[in-house]
Interface confidence: medium
């Protein structure tokens, strides 16, 4: 990019109710999702010759919440470099000065679908365990930098037709710290861990609960703890898993404990009943062992008491998952978060605006000097999004869907024509 931005580098196009003003290298913009932060378009990068996702953060500094989220996302995306976490390919703003600064555009890898579109596919054990393995690798990488995601859900996880998986959206990620009295309203309700629902604070394995919920949903084909509100969410958990022990109750704050202890007592259902053999993906006798292992993993992830719940490391070493274990993926060097105050920052709107602008300018400067971080080799998907014709065990399906990098529940594509329909 040249030192002084000129209008000839950009062009504007109307997308839904928004105007995208993007670098001319990005052509054929097509909306694929919208969420709290803005609109996401698929586009063709004429320089790299690949399809990409362009996410417009419209006036990201309009309020404290938007500003902090945008800043956090920018910093984390710039720092994190792991094959199971979405890669940032470019960042730009069409505005020329801080005074004019309005919009940020993030250019990211374009994937084929999010997990919402996979839920109604009965994946075989090989594919299911591989998807879970990749989720765990991505989560472990974040945890290694002290980042606890807390917002894992099918719409925040994207896949390609070759069964590769990436985690999206750091908007709600928060660096782990010793203060466990944190806000309970951070995770989409259905995937929210008990310790978050009950305001107990959390540690890394809060994300394991979410993985368990997602795995259960992949197996059953529907949300497993579908609460109508926060209180009902807790009811859904205990109805199925049973009322937790007195030992767990002692860890609760008095008011919460009083409420929880006064709920009806549920014995819970055996995991053999919740997840009977015959509903698991099954194509060979060998799969009976895999089914048993899958159920065992579910029973260790879906544990109400976080102190008794499996850790990410333990999950990666579980028999159902460990067949995929590769130290390069599961033990990748932790990302270096260069802003030590990332989570503690509180600023006036104008300060946020300046911080975000500096991040964008820093990216532009670094890319101009050729020092942007290395991208994983599988950074983007080819323009046709067609899987290889090989009989690779990881090939999910013949793709027949719009590509997506949508990351909010309300922005996920219609799951009725999911990408894996042709290959269960």
């Amino acid at each position: 990019m040249s030192d002084s931005k000129c209008d000839s580098q950009f062009y504007s196009v109307q997308v839904a109710d928004s105007t995208f003003t993007v670098l001319k290298r990005y052509q054929q913009l097509k909306p694929i999702g919208s969420g709290a932060q803005g609109i996401v378009c698929a586009a063709f990068d004429t320089v790299l010759g690949i399809n990409v996702a362009v996410k417009k953060l419209s006036r990201p500094f309009q309020n404290q919440t938007h500003a902090k989220r945008a800043y956090r996302e920018l910093v984390l995306l710039k720092c994190v470099n792991h094959k199971n976490i979405i890669s940032l390919l470019n960042v730009f703003t069409p505005q020329k000065t801080l005074e004019e600064f309005q919009d940020v555009y993030l250019v990211m890898e374009l994937m084929d679908a999010n997990l919402c579109q996979v839920i109604h596919m009965e994946l075989d054990h090989e594919r299911m365990s591989y998807l879970l393995y990749q989720m765990l690798c991505g989560i472990k990488h974040l945890h290694s930098a002290g980042i606890i995601h807390r917002d894992l859900k099918p719409s925040n996880i994207v896949v390609k037709s070759d069964c590769t998986l990436k985690i999206l959206d750091f908007g709600l990620a928060r660096t782990a710290c010793t203060n466990f009295m944190m806000t309970p309203y951070v995770v989409t309700r259905y995937y929210r861990a008990p310790e978050v629902i009950l305001g107990m604070g959390y540690k890394e394995n809060v994300d394991i609960w979410s993985v368990g919920c997602i795995m259960g949903e992949l197996v059953k084909g529907c949300v497993i703890f579908q609460g109508t509100d926060h209180i009902d969410q807790w009811n859904k958990v205990i109805e199925q898993l049973g009322t937790p022990s007195a030992e767990f109750m002692k860890k609760l704050q008095p008011t919460v404990r009083n409420y929880v202890e006064n709920r009806p007592k549920y014995p819970g259902i055996k995991f053999e009943e919740l997840f009977p053999d015959w509903i698991f993906p099954s194509e060979s006798e060998r799969d009976k062992i895999k089914t048993s292992q899958a159920r065992d993993l579910l029973s260790k992830m879906l544990v109400i008491d976080p102190d008794k719940r499996i850790s990410v490391d333990e999950a990666l070493r579980h028999p159902y998952i460990t067949v995929w274990y590769d130290p390069a993926e599961a033990e990748a060097p932790p990302p270096q978060i260069y802003d030590a105050q990332l989570e503690e920052r509180e600023h006036a709107i104008e300060e946020w605006k300046e911080l975000i602008y500096k991040e964008v300018m820093d990216w532009e400067e670094r890319s101009k000097n050729g020092v942007v971080k290395d991208q994983p080799s599988d950074a983007a998907v080819s323009s046709n999004a067609t899987p290889s014709q090989s009989s690779s065990i990881n090939d999910i399906s013949s793709m027949s869907t719009e590509q997506t990098l949508a990351s909010d529940t309300d922005s996920s594509l219609d799951a009725s024509t999911g990408p894996l329909e042709g290959c269960r």
């Epitope: 009965e122 197996v219 529907c222 949300v223 579908q226 053999d277 099954s282 799969d287």
Partner: antibody, heavy 117, light 107 residues
Framework: EVQLLESGGGLVQPGGSLRLSCAAS????????MSWVRQAPGKGLEWVSA????????YYADSVKGRFTISRDNSKNTLYLQMNSLRAEDTAVYYC??????????WGQGTLVTVSS | DIQMTQSPSSLSASVGDRVTITCRAS??????LNWYQQKPGKAPKLLIY???SLQSGVPSRFSGSGSGTDFTLTISSLQPEDFATYYC?????????FGQGTKLEIK
């Protein structure tokens, strides 16, 4: 298009046997669990039996346990229900249904089994 | 076994009416409830799964709600082809059980 076609129903005496078949097409048969659901004349629906995609795991309602056997031949895309020691209360229309984990998303048209002397 | 009880057992309504059928489980079944439609001499057809998710191809006038023990199937504006028998089914724990059915007739 998903299609399920039952056959093998008919009139049988109490204590007799019958084997029902369900020919499936339009989907990857071996990837889906399958079920038999029955409906006595003028009555409601009763889930009878289920089998996993490989045939390795089966489930039976208490009312038929020990008398009925569910099986499948994935090479022929066919589901079976072997019914022995039939009783008058087994009289029903028997439907085969594709079991998408926790619900039955496609059903055959059914075959009538009448147990009477 | 979990018992499923539907009410009413039958009801008469007119085209264009809004109709509600309820289903009660003998114990909490979370959101593991499905609704089926059956016409005389035909196989049942899945309408709603997981209490509120509309099966692909089913008209949007059908909706489901509820959680725990009490569930509702609503038809917002009855069409002539909607006159049939409706069944609820729990898939919370085996054996999966059905309600006795609700027959919807033309008034």
């Amino acid at each position: 298009e998903v299609q399920l076609l039952e056959s093998g129903g008919g009139l049988v005496q109490p204590g007799g046997s019958l084997r029902l078949s369900c020919a499936a097409s339009g989907f990857t048969f071996s990837s889906y669990a399958m079920s038999w659901v029955r409906q006595a004349p003028g009555k409601g629906l009763e889930w009878v039996s289920a089998i996993s995609g490989s045939g390795g795991s089966t489930y039976y309602a208490d009312s038929v346990k020990g008398r009925f056997t569910i099986s499948r031949d994935n090479s022929k895309n066919t589901l079976y229900l072997q019914m022995n020691s039939l009783r008058a209360e087994d009289t029903a229309v028997y439907y085969c249904a594709r079991s998408h984990t926790v619900y039955f998303d496609y059903w055959g048209q059914g075959t009538l089994v009448t147990v009477s002397s | 076994d979990i018992q499923m009880t539907q009410s009413p057992s039958s009801l008469s309504a007119s085209v264009g009416d809004r109709v509600t059928i309820t289903c009660r489980a003998s114990q909490s079944i979370s959101s593991y409830l499905n609704w089926y439609q059956q016409k005389p001499g035909k196989a049942p057809k899945l309408l709603i799964y997981a209490a509120s998710s509309l099966q692909s191809g089913v008209p949007s006038r059908f909706s489901g709600s509820g959680s725990g023990t009490d569930f509702t199937l609503t038809i917002s504006s009855l069409q002539p082809e909607d006159f049939a028998t409706y069944y609820c089914q729990q898939s919370y724990s085996t054996p999966y059980t059905f309600g006795q059915g609700t027959k919807l007739e033309i008034k």
